[in-house]
Interface confidence: low
């Protein structure tokens, strides 16, 4: 028999069946070409010294033989005595070693067996009912296929899978999706109603991330707050990069799981937007106040996790960059304004309050007056800080309000608010001898030194009331105490002490007498 | 001939447990998914849960956290672990497989005959 031809004779060996397990296997037969076919099969086991003998049985009954040495592949023509436009069977037996092993057969026509493609080009991944579903276009005149899946993720080997039967211009199929590993997953395609025609080749990979992106394990930093008022937010440890099965592990796009920050600004409610999200790598600055950041994983599927931090409000405050003065008519605070056309942020809440919610005012974007300050006003009827304690007042800045990470702190600061003058006025003034020309006087803090930074000093009015000489001492802002000398025996003395800010002298606490008593020596 | 069996229902008090058991026999392939469905009188079949070859599990939001689908190869076995089961859990309880998935999910070409059970408050 010619080698290119199939030898209608019986093979030359003896048909004893192996009965094991391995062999040859997944035979395939296709067209190739008008007048050119192939088959192709794998085989499992050693391979030396095995035979290989591609049989085939026609419609006829009559059946024959190509040989083909150790190769598994095999292309033969139409003239080669198999009939292409009928049903045959085809099936491999590999001799060696007087023994026979056979592969399942196929029974197909040869004419119509074309060898498909893959799905190709774009396909498509959505969650449907916790289930993975994937979409492609059907390859060109190749309607009517049987579609296999196999998947894979970075710890387990491949699982095979059956997508059913196709019969339209697209094509789509159901697969396991993972909660919390990613997968890779590859198609192929083959004739829909011929068992034996042969499988594609695999599809290339579609990478498929867990349906629960990962909780993102970051770390932040926030720098100090700049002289521009600003302080930068930094990164000190990157998300974990998720597992990824072999064939995802190139620039696979599918898989990839994105972070995003969404920054809170917790102060200043009254502004126009107080959350922003933006990309994890374009780390924010921040402007002194207090905010919630949070760390938003999502993949093709959605958001996943999020992890959450709180940066408080930077508390460093500057006591002298406030000027704020009271009039008939009400209060202006003053203070050094920024650029042209900024919009400030007012906001004031009682020390000690800091749980309840701050009051805010925002400005119309004002220019800097002559002596270059910018200024917030308000009537007494208003009542803004109108009681008597103290309040804690931040000014925050901004060119371009509606944006988030554009804000600025101006001044951190405290004051006291309502009639300061007389509710600052020291209380339990009292007078203790210290020595024979010395006494001791005493007084209670006043409640301006509860706002830090607001009280600037003590002074204590000693008047002689005999000559009616007065001296005045001052005296730093911790102490409550102070010893006055070079006192005369037997003179009445008033004392009387008040507390001042910077802006404001105080009112003078009740006059309290007293005198030193004459030593009468024995 | 596939044939699939199911055991493990009755009637129970609100808040306990039962294990429903569903036996195959007959299948030849290996690559099947594996579920249950519940139908009660008046009512759309219900599905409540799935297994998959490879592991996977889907459920019902209204059994998610409660019932457990599991499966053993070896016996051609799947089990429902139902435990804090309410009176709205009463139903016939039938286990399903399919071997073919098509665009629309698995199709459960081969069904059991369906177990009965009962939640009383």
């Known amino acids: 028999c010619r080698t290119s031809e199939c030898c209608f004779q019986d093979p030359p060996y003896s048909d004893a069946d192996s009965g094991s397990a391995s062999g040859p296997r997944d035979l395939s037969c296709y067209r190739i070409s008008s007048a050119g076919y192939e088959c192709s099969w794998q085989y499992e086991g050693p391979t030396a010294g095995v035979s290989h003998f591609l049989r085939c049985c026609l419609s006829s009954g009559r059946c024959c033989y190509f040989a083909t040495g150790s190769a598994t592949r095999l292309q033969f023509s139409d003239q080669a005595g198999v009939s292409v436009l009928h049903t045959v069977t085809l099936w491999v037996e590999s001799w060696a070693r007087n023994r026979t092993e056979k592969s399942p057969e196929v029974t197909l026509q040869l004419y119509k067996s074309v060898k498909y493609k893959p799905p190709l080009g774009d396909i498509k991944v959505s969650k449907l009912a916790g289930q993975l579903r994937m979409e492609w276009e059907t390859p060109d005149n190749q309607v009517g296929a049987e579609v296999q899946f196999r998947h894979r993720t970075p710890s387990s080997s491949w699982k095979l899978g059956d997508c059913g039967p196709q019969d339209d211009d697209t094509e789509s199929c159901l697969c396991p999706l993972e909660m919390n590993v990613a997968q890779e997953f590859q198609l192929r395609r083959r004739r829909l109603g011929s068992q034996g025609s042969s499988w594609s080749k695999w599809s290339s990979p579609v990478c498929v991330p867990p349906e629960n992106p990962p909780q993102p394990q970051v770390r932040f930093s926030v720098e100090q707050l700049g002289r521009d008022g600003r302080r930068r937010l930094t990164l000190k440890e990157q998300p974990t990069q998720l597992e990824l099965p072999e064939g995802c592990q190139g620039p696979a796009p599918g898989v990839e799981v994105t972070y995003q920050l969404q920054l809170h600004m917790l102060s200043c409610p009254c502004k126009a937007k107080a959350t922003r999200t933006l990309p994890l790598e374009k780390m924010p600055y921040l402007s002194g106040a207090a905010y919630n950041v949070a760390v938003i994983s999502s993949n093709r599927f959605g958001p996943g996790p999020n992890q959450t931090w709180h940066i408080p409000a930077d508390t460093h405050t500057e006591p002298v960059a406030l000027n704020i003065s009271v009039g008939t008519n009400g209060t202006t605070m003053y203070w050094p304004a920024r650029a042209q056309s900024t919009t400030y942020c007012i906001e004031w809440q009682p020390v000690g309050q800091e749980g309840s919610l701050a009051t805010c005012n925002l400005t119309a974007p004002q220019d800097p007056d002559p002596a270059g300050m910018a200024t917030y006003s308000w009537s007494r009827e208003s009542g803004a800080m109108g009681q008597e304690k103290c309040y804690h007042i931040t000014i925050f800045a901004s060119a371009h309000p509606k944006k988030l990470t554009l804000w600025s702190t101006v001044l951190s600061t405290y004051h006291f608010g309502g009639n300061a003058s007389a509710a600052g006025t020291p209380h339990h003034v009292s007078v203790k001898n210290h020595s024979l020309d010395s006494v001791s006087v005493d007084w209670a803090p006043s409640l301006l030194s509860t706002c830090p930074g607001v009280l600037k000093e003590y002074v204590v009015r000693c008047r002689d009331e005999d000559s009616n000489q007065v001296s005045e001492h001052p005296v730093q802002p911790t102490e409550t105490q102070v010893t006055l000398s070079d006192l005369r025996a037997g003179v009445a003395y008033t004392v009387q002490v008040r507390a001042d800010t910077a802006w404001l002298r105080g009112a003078w606490s009740q006059p309290q007498r007293f005198s030193i008593k004459v030593q009468v020596s024995d | 001939q596939v044939q699939l069996v199911e055991s493990g229902g009755g009637a129970v008090q609100a808040g306990g447990s039962l294990r429903l058991s569903c036996a195959a026999s007959?299948?030849?392939?290996?690559?099947?998914?594996m579920a249950w469905f519940r139908q009660a009188p008046g009512i759309e079949r219900e599905f409540v849960a799935s297994i998959w070859w490879g592991g996977s599990t889907y459920y019902a939001d209204s059994v998610k956290d409660r019932f457990t689908i599991s499966r053993d190869n070896a016996e051609n076995t799947v089990y429902l672990q139902m435990n804090s089961l309410k009176p709205e859990d009463t139903a016939v309880y039938r286990c399903a497989v399919g071997t073919k998935i098509g665009t629309m999910g698995p199709r459960y070409d081969y069904w059991g005959q369906g177990t009965q059970v009962t939640v009383s408050s």
């Open positions: 007959g299948l030849t392939s290996r690559h099947y998914v």
